[in-house]
Amino acid sequence: HNTTVFQGVAGQSLQVSCPYDSMKHWGRRKAWCRQLGEKGPCQRVVSTHNLWLLSFLRRWNGSTAITDDTLGGTLTITLRNLQPHDAGLYQCQSLHGSEADTLRKVLVEVLADPLDHRDAGDLWFPGESESFEDAHVEHSISRSLLEGEIPFPPTS
């Protein structure tokens, strides 16, 4: 699998999309996991609804949401209020039994907020009770890693 890079701005929302063959993965739940080290396990962050037919319903775990368009074959992950510690390597997965097939490897990069030098009073921070369903999602910049690029620093 090639790795696709998604760049987002700190404090904003980043949307990651993972396309897949909707027939090949019919009936399968999906998940978003974070790769722990270059050869380490992929730790589950969030998965789609337990009932596959309800996969279109957005599920949250903390600031990460997942929703699946099972007909169109697109898994969408939203990272809300992106922080520097969110940067890293992730995977979109298709689940069957206890197995997981990788749909896409994703490298999330967090860019500094160009506005962060301004007075905080100039910025809008949504309250805890406010819905994020209609919040503006910053368009992500994505690209595939070039040959030879590595998502992790080399280890000795």
Partner: antibody, heavy 123, light 107 residues
Framework: EVQLVQSGAEVKKPGESLKISCKGS????????IAWVRQMPGKGLEWMGT????????RLSPSFQGQVTISADKSISTAYLQWSSLKASDTAMYFC????????????????WGQGTLVTVSS | DIQMTQSPSSVSASVGDRVTITCRAS??????LAWYQQKPGKAPKLLIY???SRQNGVPSRFSGSGSGTDFTLTISSLQPEDFATYFC?????????FGQGTKLEIK
């Protein structure tokens, strides 16, 4: 009506090559995984591997890795199981089966089976 | 690999009897288990999937239960056509593995 029709019985000598087939009809062949299962004489069932004809993505059992090749030709709705050099121990009945994912379970089960192809390898 | 162990390996029963076959997985497989029936010279037939869901067209006398490592297939009232060999199969992980089979014979 969903049907998987397998090629006829084969009698071969050790060292010979062989390719058996499984033709699907009555459903969208390219949209379901196809598995191959071995049953040696008087024995149980052994899963050999699975292929998705849509893109030929394959899962092979470690027990059969390097022993057989699984392939598919989606244009003619046919899956294949082949050997490059048969052994006497390959003598068995070989079944193909459609692998169906049940949406409220998110795993797959073999819901339709071919009639089986008997392969006999003897000098 | 996950090992599947069936018991008994054979059982003799009469028409009308209630028969229970058990299947044990070497590790937890949630409810990812199927039961198949095979008659001599024929292909296996899916009876039960997801441990307890009956496949379309399978008579209600067949039922499955269990989760984790221990599973059972029950035939509530044996019919003449039920004498066959029964296999369990895990759908938890690759490689898919089957039990060794339970032969149900007429007493």
């Amino acid at each position: 009506e969903v049907q998987l029709v397998q090629s006829g019985a084969e009698v071969k000598k050790p060292g010979e090559s062989l390719k058996i087939s499984c033709k699907g009809s009555g459903y969208s062949f390219n949209s379901y995984w196809i598995a191959w299962v071995r049953q040696m004489p008087g024995k149980g069932l052994e899963w050999m591997g699975t292929i998705y004809p849509g893109d030929s993505d394959t899962r092979l059992s470690p027990s059969f890795q390097g022993q057989v090749t699984i392939s598919a030709d989606k244009s003619i709705s046919t899956a294949y199981l082949q050997w490059s050099s048969l052994k006497a121990s390959d003598t068995a009945m070989y079944f193909c089966a459609r692998s169906r994912t049940f949406y409220y379970d998110s795993s797959d089960y073999f819901d339709y089976w071919g009639q089986g192809t008997l392969v006999t390898v003897s000098s | 690999d996950i090992q599947m162990t069936q018991s008994p390996s054979s059982v003799s029963a009469s028409v009308g009897d209630r028969v229970t076959i058990t299947c044990r997985a070497s590790q937890g497989i949630s409810s990812w288990l199927a039961w198949y029936q095979q008659k001599p010279g024929k292909a296996p037939k899916l009876l039960i999937y997801a441990a307890s869901s009956r496949q379309n067209g399978v008579p209600s006398r067949f039922s499955g239960s269990g989760s984790g490592t221990d599973f059972t297939l029950t035939i509530s009232s044996l019919q003449p056509e039920d004498f066959a060999t029964y296999f369990c199969q895990q759908a938890d992980s690759y490689p898919r593995t089957f039990g060794q089979g339970t032969k149900l014979e007429i007493k």
